[in-house]
Interface confidence: medium
């Protein structure tokens, strides 16, 4: 079955609780549920989401039974209307509950909170989390699936699947070792970064999607299929991007069992055609069903296929360029991307969409021109600069990362963009610059040939958590501009800012700068984060502070912590070492 | 030997309907996305519309959309294009092609069928 061609079915609740099994429907009904009633206890989704399947299997005994016939927003969205406390704990959000479908679901998706009040996860000791697991390893894996998916209301329902799989296999294999908690922390950790890059990659695509169109998706799918497949004809790079549009359209608009489903087939698609596609899939489509799908989203590029004509030719010299152009827009130009993103896997899909771009823009305006060859026979010359920049900034930032390490990599980072958007949340600007700064250690290891993809690419998806988070409370006319005038230009555009000459500096407040002893026992990370914090927030009070005071200043934190976490009587020296330090950086800094 | 053959052409009034088919042989049909081309006379070729092996996605000229659907049957190795609420413009010679492996060249074609719009 084809991911467009569908049997009419009576019952859709029935024909995907066929599909996807009772395990994977339950799943994915308690992800959806998660994502949208974020507050709700999981006591509460698990009985709501035992309600919709034993409503399903009556549909899947007869199809023509009572509400068999509705669609699953209708029937999801009654129930998550049925939640006794939804406008307590909701608010205004209870009033979708008013609407009709489809309003009713786009309302529920406009209230997915990106950053919802709740408690950081924290960590059992390793005998509680197995013995947990063993008691009720059903009701311990629902609750990692919830946990997360509250968390992240837009994970990628199918890949959170294999996510939990994953798991469940770390606790299966670590609560039968020898020594428990190293063989299941390490596994542990991994999921966690693993899962919040995971996360962070889908938020990319979904506000692409909704905030930018399936045209702008579609682009980008384009660009980096031809990457990944360049052996592919350009008819399998279009069948591709239109299959995996809808799949991540699906997800990103909360349908979640159409959007798993739909993801199978184009696995079974892609492994049935895998030769007309590429030689690096044989590996992935040996493996199951959850596995095989994340094999083929993470599968390497395959070789270019050897003696690719120039580019010129089709799209520069011949005389036909304006006549292809104007007969089919898009498609002319999706075959412009194509060509170039399979003879450059060198180049990150935001660059190759930038040189699209700027090649349309160029027959826009020579087409319509007295000699249209004329006009746009240098195109190619104008590609440079747009090439050179992101390659020079790259080259910049990984020689400051081989001299400064990550953590000093991540300071250099917070202190220019603090500077850049000083109005924005001190913690979201810790967030955000200390995963601006984790670029270092992800890509400037790599050759110059991958350096780009892997960098800016990853810039994108990082900038991409500033805008989402920004967009819930507005503080800055600079981060709106440069998150919604376009997709692919954000890094540049966040590039460019200079120092905000019209923020008023914020008041110091002594407060800010007081420390407990309580920094004695954080990990290291945590730490880190408190640290910077303290930097965010010292370049508020003095945005024209220089490099050379601020690290006056954050040595001398440093030293005070270092010290005071030494002491015998920690609070006292906390109290007073304290007050010293903020009077002697209030001095430094001329506050 | 690698072998299309259009039929269905003809004349017919503004408005009106007509059926093209094209049979295919000596390629594996079901594993090649084929299109359409048509060609006005004294005019240069235009592409008219582009069907996936599987069926989907398809695509169309601008000059088309919403008149004309592209579709095929692997089973009987044929490809077909209805055109509905023809136009004068629309008089052409009307060529199936196997669609290009990359660049902007045309395999194989057929010999065409002649579509005539007019009252």
């Known amino acids: 079955r084809g991911v467009f061609r569908r049997d009419a079915h009576k019952s859709e609740v029935a024909h995907r609780f066929k599909d996807l099994g009772e395990e994977n429907f339950k799943a994915l009904v308690l992800i959806a549920f998660a994502q949208y009633l974020q507050q709700c206890p999981f006591e509460d989704h698990v009985k709501l989401v035992n309600e919709v399947t034993e409503f399903a299997k009556t549909c899947v005994a007869d199809e023509s039974a009572e509400n068999c016939d509705k669609s699953l927003h209708t029937l999801f969205g009654d129930k998550l209307c049925t939640v006794a406390t939804l406008r307590e704990t909701y608010g205004e959000m209870a009033d979708c509950c008013a609407k009709q479908e489809p309003e009713r679901n786009e309302c529920f998706l406009q209230h997915k909170d990106d950053n919802p009040n709740l408690p950081r996860l924290v960590r059992p000791e390793v005998d509680v989390m197995c013995t947990a697991f063993h008691d009720n390893e059903e009701t311990f894996l629902k609750k990692y699936l919830y946990e997360i998916a509250r968390r992240h209301p837009y994970f990628y329902a199918p890949e959170l699947l294999f996510f939990a799989k994953r798991y469940k296999a770390a606790f299966t294999e670590c609560c039968q070792a020898a020594d428990k908690a190293a063989c299941l922390l390490p596994k542990l950790d991994e999921l966690r970064d693993e899962g919040k890059a995971s996360s962070a990659k889908q938020r990319l695509k979904c506000a692409s999607l909704q905030k930018f169109g399936e045209r702008a998706f579609k682009a980008w799918a384009v660009a980096r299929l031809s990457q990944r497949f360049p052996k592919a004809e350009f008819a399998e790079v279009s069948k591709l991007v239109t299959d995996l549009t809808k799949v991540h359209t699906e997800c990103c608009h909360g349908d979640l069992l159409e959007c798993a489903d739909d993801r199978a087939d184009l696995a079974k698609y892609i492994c049935e055609n895998q030769d007309s596609i590429s030689s690096k899939l044989k590996e992935c489509c040996e493996k199951p069903l959850l596995e095989k799908s994340h094999c083929i989203a993470e599968v390497e590029n395959d070789e270019m296929p050897a003696d690719l004509p120039s580019l010129a030719a089709d799209f520069v010299e011949s005389k036909d360029v304006c006549k292809n152009y104007a007969e089919a827009k898009d498609v002319f130009l999706g075959m412009f991307l194509y060509e170039y993103a399979r003879r450059h896997p060198d180049y990150s899909v935001v660059l190759l969409l930038r040189l699209a771009k700027t090649y349309e823009t160029t027959l826009e305006k020579c087409c319509a021109a007295a000699d249209p060859h004329e006009c746009y026979a240098k195109v190619f010359d104008e590609f440079k600069p747009l090439v050179e920049e992101p390659q020079n900034l790259i080259k910049q930032n990984c020689e400051l990362f081989e001299q400064l390490g990550e953590y000093k990599f991540q300071n250099a980072l917070l202190v220019r963009y603090t500077k850049k958007v000083p109005q924005v949340s001190t913690p979201t600007l810790v967030e955000v610059s200390r995963n601006l700064g984790k670029v270092g250690s992800k890509c400037c290891k790599h050759p110059e040939a991958k350096r780009m993809p892997c960098a800016e690419d990853y810039l994108s998806v990082v900038l991409n958590q500033l805008c989402v988070l920004h967009e819930k409370t507005p503080v800055s006319d600079r981060v709106t501009k440069c998150c919604t005038e376009s997709l692919v230009n954000r890094r540049p555009c966040f590039s460019a800012l200079e120092v905000d000459e019209t923020y008023v500096p914020k008041e110091f407040n002594a407060e800010t700068f007081t420390f407990h002893a309580d920094i004695c026992t954080l990990s290291e990370k945590e730490r880190q984060i408190k640290k910077q914090t303290a930097l965010v927030e010292l370049v508020k009070h003095k945005p024209k502070a220089t490099k050379e005071q601020l690290k006056a200043v954050m040595d001398d934190f440093a030293a005070f912590v270092e010290k005071c976490c030494k002491a015998d009587d920690k609070e006292t020296c906390f109290a007073e070492e304290g007050k010293k330090l903020v009077a002697a950086s209030q001095a430094a800094l001329g506050l | 030997e690698v072998q299309l053959l259009e039929s269905g052409g003809g004349l017919v009034q503004p408005g009106g309907s007509l059926r093209l088919s094209c049979a295919a042989s000596g390629f594996t049909f079901d594993t090649s996305s084929m299109l359409w081309v048509r060609q006005a006379p004294g005019k240069g070729l235009e592409w008219v519309s582009v069907?996936?092996?599987?069926?989907?996605?398809?695509y169309y000229a601008d000059s088309v959309k919403g008149r004309f659907t592209i579709s095929r049957d692997n089973s009987k190795n044929t490809l077909y294009l209805q055109m509905n609420s023809l136009r004068a413009e629309d008089t052409a010679l009307y060529y199936c092609a196997k669609f290009p492996s990359s660049r902007m060249k045309f395999d194989y074609w057929g010999q065409g069928t002649l579509v005539t719009v007019k009252s």
């Open positions: 069907i996936h092996q599987s069926g989907t996605p398809t």
